[in-house]
């Protein structure tokens, strides 16, 4: 496979990763698929420094990240360990609130207007951030 050594056009490089910030909204699953089509993933926040970087770029706008608990426990889309990793939830979040009247609870995490995290209904059309790592071989699958 080939290694990506610089970020694609319209992506922002930071600490050996590339970030892309949407200008419109999609449901969490559609945002996740969009990032995958770009050979990326929804942003995985692993440090306070990365949190501040993303927060600076998205501003005070609800924005999806690559964290969900649709199958039970909270999981990052790239396999980063949730339990031992960085967290920045709002007070009393996540709460899996059922009172929204949309059916079910809240299974997808997003940045809120102050940057802290909240769980919300995955179907809400929020903006999103894609991330891909530099110097990572793009494991091209073998041809069948």
């Amino acid at each position: 496979g080939s290694e990506r050594t610089c970020c694609p056009v319209n992506w922002v490089e930071h600490e050996r990763s590339c970030y892309w910030f949407s200008r419109s909204g999609k449901a969490w699953a559609d945002a996740d698929n969009y990032c995958r089509l770009e050979d990326a993933h929804l942003v995985v926040v692993t440090s306070w420094e990365e949190q501040k970087f993303v927060q600076h770029h998205i501003g005070p706008v609800n924005t999806w990240m690559g964290l969900h608990d649709q199958n039970g426990p909270w999981k990052w889309v790239d396999g980063t360990d949730y339990e031992t990793g960085f967290k920045n939830w709002r007070p009393e979040q996540p709460d899996d609130w059922y009172g929204h009247g949309l059916g079910g609870g809240e299974d997808c995490a997003h940045f809120t207007d102050d940057g802290r995290w909240n769980d919300d209904v995955c179907q809400r059309p929020y903006r999103w951030v894609c991330e891909t790592e530099l110097d990572k071989a793009s494991q091209e699958p073998p041809l069948l």
């Epitope: 496979g1 080939s2 694609p8 319209n10 949407s22 200008r23 419109s24 909204g25 999609k26 449901a27 699953a29 559609d30 698929n33 969009y34 995958r36 089509l37 770009e38 050979d39 059309p125 793009s138 494991q139 091209e140 699958p141």
Partner: antibody, heavy 121, light 107 residues
Framework: EVQLLESGGGLVQPGGSLRLSCAAS????????MSWVRQAPGKGLEWVSA????????FYADSVKGRFTISRDNSKNTLFLQMNSLRAEDTAVYYC??????????????WGQGTTVTVSS | DIQMTQSPSSVSASVGDRVTITCRAS??????LAWYQQKPGKAPKLLIY???SLQSGVPSRFSGSGSETDFTLTISSLQPEDFATYYC?????????FGQGTKVEIK
């Protein structure tokens, strides 16, 4: 000039297999997602499958999931569609298409001329 | 899946006419909509993306508008080469889906 050229279509019996190819030229193939779209005789367009630039991530219509496999060889600038367990309803002209992008992926901006697949006994 | 419904299914018009085709999505798709033109025996051609952005090389008589569920393709002054079938396509959610097509015929 940006070009896509499909090949591999033909007549195949129900339950049979076929592999379509799409040769790309005139652009940096590995940096673009690609797609297959089909059109049954006298019918409209139906999206079949898409694949990311590296080939790692793939997407399928429910009608072909588990039977068709999209792949690509970026060293040869070629897109593939492996079609197994073919059915009469898979009979169509198959087009490969490049996904254009500016800030977003926005649509299929370059299309091949199409290759005809006929599934019949 | 998101259903895309075009109307009318066909329209008869004369050269110079203003032609409007509508496309309705079964749920909101923001502006994730493209329009294509297809002539018999030929591959489709991208006309409009992001609901209202004109693809490079496409004549300015073509325009698109709308957002969420209701979209329009307008040909301001129909030319002989515009007689064709037009399709809308949503790219908001997989599976991507097309409208059933609108055939623009000579009156």
């Amino acid at each position: 000039e940006v070009q896509l050229l499909e090949s591999g279509g033909g007549l195949v019996q129900p339950g049979g297999s076929l592999r379509l190819s799409c040769a790309a030229s005139g652009f940096t193939f590995s940096t673009y997602a690609m797609s297959w779209v089909r059109q049954a005789p006298g019918k409209g367009l139906e999206w079949v499958s898409a694949i990311s630039g590296s080939g790692v991530n793939t997407f399928y219509a429910d009608s072909v999931k588990g039977r068709f496999t999209i792949s690509r060889d970026n060293s040869k600038n070629t897109l593939f569609l492996q079609m197994n367990s073919l059915r009469a309803e898979d009979t169509a002209v198959y087009y490969c298409a490049k996904l254009g992008k500016d800030y977003y992926y926005y649509g299929m901006d370059v299309w091949g001329q199409g290759t005809t697949v006929t599934v019949s006994s | 899946d998101i259903q895309m419904t075009q109307s009318p299914s066909s329209v008869s018009a004369s050269v110079g006419d203003r032609v409007t085709i509508t496309c309705r999505a079964s749920q909101g798709i923001s502006s994730w909509l493209a329009w294509y033109q297809q002539k018999p025996g030929k591959a489709p051609k991208l006309l409009i993306y992001d609901a209202s952005s004109l693809q490079s090389g496409v004549p300015s008589r073509f325009s698109g508008s709308g957002s969420e569920t209701d979209f329009t393709l307008t040909i301001s002054s129909l030319q002989p080469e515009d007689f064709a079938t037009y399709y809308c396509q949503q790219a908001n959610s997989f599976p991507w889906t097309f409208g059933q097509g609108t055939k623009v015929e000579i009156k």
